[in-house]
Interface confidence: low
Amino acid sequence: KSSNEATNITPKHNMKAFLDELKAENIKKFLYNFTQIPHLAGTEQNFQLAKQIQSQWKEFGLDSVELAHYDVLLSYPNKTHPNYISIINEDGNEIFNTSLFEPPPPGYENVSDIVPPFSAFSPQGMPEGDLVYVNYARTEDFFKLERDMKINCSGKIVIARYGKVFRGNKVKNAQLAGAKGVILYSDPADYFAPGVKSYPDGWNLPGGGVQRGNILNLNGAGDPLTPGYPANEYAYRRGIAEAVGLPSIPVHPIGYYDAQKLLEKMGGSAPPDSSWRGSLKVPYNVGPGFTGNFSTQKVKMHIHSTNEVTRIYNVIGTLRGAVEPDRYVILGGHRDSWVFGGIDPQSGAAVVHEIVRSFGTLKKEGWRPRRTILFASWDAEEFGLLGSTEWAEENSRLLQERGVAYINADSSIEGNYTLRVDCTPLMYSLVHNLTKELKSPDEGFEGKSLYESWTKKSPSPEFSGMPRISKLGSGNDFEVFFQRLGIASGRARYTKNWETNKFSGYPLYHSVYETYELVEKFYDPMFKYHLTVAQVRGGMVFELANSIVLPFDCRDYAVVLRKYADKIYSISMKHPQEMKTYSVSFDSLFSAVKNFTEIASKFSERLQDFDKSNPIVLRMMNDQLMFLERAFIDPLGLPDRPFYRHVIYAPSSHNKYAGESFPGIYDALFDIESKVDPSKAWGEVKRQIYVAAFTVQAAAETLSEVA
């Protein structure tokens, strides 16, 4: 039975009918509705929003919509004992205190339950000591401090600027350096675009604005107390001392007005080079400690936040497939926000809502997708991707057998310049073909395709005439599906011009100023970029759920595998003598990649020729495509990161947001020249090459003729 027998709409109009039903005005209306009050994970307000979404998805026409709840570890400031940082004099008197809250934006002065800026999961503590400025607190920044400048951070409070890498990596690096506290701040160099006003007059960060965020190093574990398993009613929970990924030193974020007060007194060493200087009118001295007249003054942190096991709620909607109901295409994005969530996440949640409404409209007219579509409104993403991870842990056996694809739907915009896509190579051709069919919303590209404007503004560094598509890293809800379960995944949003705007993320990220008005006034007044993102995300889901043959091209994986093998080989070849001494060879990896390329080519030829009317053969070929991503999963996981199991891609060990290729080999090679036991270190490189070569070869064989 073909999918068309389950519908009143002819096949060539299916996608068009779906896309035409998507309306910018609806997305705008939904965004407004979702952003009037805070929806912090674990709060009553966010539970009420979950029930509202459940009710509306049912009205839209989904077959079922359920709430899936979990009891996970969350973190909140103490309402009666606020967090702050002081400068204290030699008598211990506080002569300067950082602000306790962000000045509320116009129109929101009387809103209750705005959580003050804090670093989620910071332990309590009141450390005091000398300050050391550590730039972005990246691995290379600490190398510069410790190895080149001989500055010891042990027992010091470090101050780091936000940006470049995930804040949890900054905290981990500071801990490893022996720091006893971390102050995170937003420097105007990274969060204030020149020539743009600060909110409410523009989209820049005001001096009192502060970025909230979690500082965990979960490495894909989900709830810190129940790694690997769902945090359900009968869960066994670890003690807090054995919890996964919690920081061990107090951490607190501040804005640049407060940072100015701390940094202006800094003494000690001068910054090593201009890359360590931000845009404040301070010397950016590294320290340790304050200069001259202020040398007896210290910095003291006052952190009283608590970790609490709290109930969270995912909303899971189902649109049953007519032909292959046991094959799941998932569209998911989170619902919880730090405050109002004007961009993160509600610009994404509003798009998901409109996509559900459009699919529901088609279903009410008699249509069904070929495969089942699952829609998810995840909770507690901001606290470590907890909602999505717990749900995936609970449903892992179903997902690993039935999961076709996962499309992520967090923030729809982080700018309004061009499209940004990160996805598995299996989806490259799907994204290319889809964007060629969509109209560009960009000024100057009227009547042109989205593919054309995207390619022009964000060209591929390798292939001329094609757009850039990036590797998946982490820091969002696709993580468990891709990195742990090996389900083909992708994400799309509108972004800024990275060439001219070198700030990190968007300036008002995770601040109280991320409001509906920020989007409506400054980013997307016509909601045309939101509509385009809805078309891309929704179109991908539509094709994945409805095409007779899955729209995956395994040949694109072959191309990137060769590129990644070349890259990791060139990194290793920076140590030619050691490679010779320890007999390090990449022959097995290149051989496996060659085999993969040949087998993928032959598979693609068979895919063109097979009898698509034979449901058994069709299912067999589709299963080979579906399970290809799964074949890159190593059940043992990466070293010390058991929940990162994808051998080709993992979040960088130095920046959770970034994807790294052949991460096992990369990490084994990283800083290898400093290892105390070179023989052991190069042995691990050889082992990782072996694992990678085996995995690529094994994946190739899943594409071979079955008998």
């Epitope: 009666t80 004992h81 309590q124 001392a241 061990s248």
Partner: antibody
Framework: QVQLVQSGGGLVQPGGSLRLSCAAS????????MSWVRQAPGKGLEWVAN????????YYVDSVKGRFTISRDNAKNSLYLQMNSLRAEDTAVYYC?????????????????WGQGTMVTVSS | VIWMTQSPSSVSASVGDRVTITCRAS??????LAWYQQKPGKAPKLLIY???NLQSGVPSRFSGSGSGTDFTLTISSLQPEDFATYYC?????????FGGGTKVDIK
């Protein structure tokens, strides 16, 4: 100034009762677990009891269970220890102490603020 | 009950000496350990929490280390005001228990 000021000690006969008080100032009393710790003459420290911020959870050392009761009045910023059926071995300096939950919202991590201590002597 | 055993029970040292006091738990307590200093007739004072974290206002010559069952308090260079009795305390589970104390006196 953060401080705990104790009162209520004294001499009592075996089997008698005594109520110790501890007045807190300089911090948000209702945000902290509180404790009583004692020290017999010439001996080491012994934890006696803990009470949660809202008084909903209480814990005792086995040797005082059923005889001593820890309580608090957050409106008055005060902590109490009601001691009944006193024995000679209860003779000690009793300290009230603030519990500092430095890592997790648990019931006992470290005692960061201490009262001055009050002597309780149980003797006939 | 988790029993805490401190050693030595007393130590005689001179100003400037490095003094090390050990504390052993009868079962694993992760890093849930605090160290206190007590002078005669005075209330104890918190020095170290979470096994190795220096409480604010405590001189940096005091340091703590260890995890699991074995812990150490080190005074890197003994000062006249450091002559006192030192106690460890576990906060892993109820009942909370203290070590027997180590008296540091003048040699």
């Amino acid at each position: 100034q953060v401080q705990l000021v104790q009162s209520g000690g004294g001499l009592v006969q075996p089997g008698g009762s005594l109520r110790l008080s501890c007045a807190a100032s300089g911090f948000t009393f209702s945000s902290y677990w509180m404790s009583w710790v004692r020290q017999a003459p010439g001996k080491g420290l012994e934890w006696v009891a803990n009470i949660k911020q809202d008084g909903s959870e209480k814990y005792y050392v086995d040797s005082v269970k059923g005889r001593f009761t820890i309580s608090r009045d957050n409106a008055k910023n005060s902590l109490y220890l009601q001691m009944n059926s006193l024995r000679a071995e209860d003779t000690a300096v009793y300290y009230c102490a603030r519990v500092w939950d430095y890592y997790y919202d648990s019931s006992g991590d470290a005692f960061d603020i201490w009262g001055q201590g009050t002597m309780v002597t149980v003797s006939s | 009950v988790i029993w805490m055993t401190q050693s030595p029970s007393s130590v005689s040292a001179s100003v400037g000496d490095r003094v090390t006091i050990t504390c052993r738990a009868s079962q694993g307590i992760s890093s849930w350990l605090a160290w206190y200093q007590q002078k005669p007739g005075k209330a104890p004072k918190l020095l170290i929490y979470a096994a190795s974290n220096l409480q604010s206002g405590v001189p940096s010559r005091f340091s703590g280390s260890g995890s699991g069952t074995d812990f150490t308090l080190t005074i890197s260079s003994l000062q006249p005001e450091d002559f006192a009795t030192y106690y460890c305390q576990q906060a892993n589970s109820f009942p909370l228990t203290f070590g027997g104390g180590t008296k540091v006196d003048i040699k």
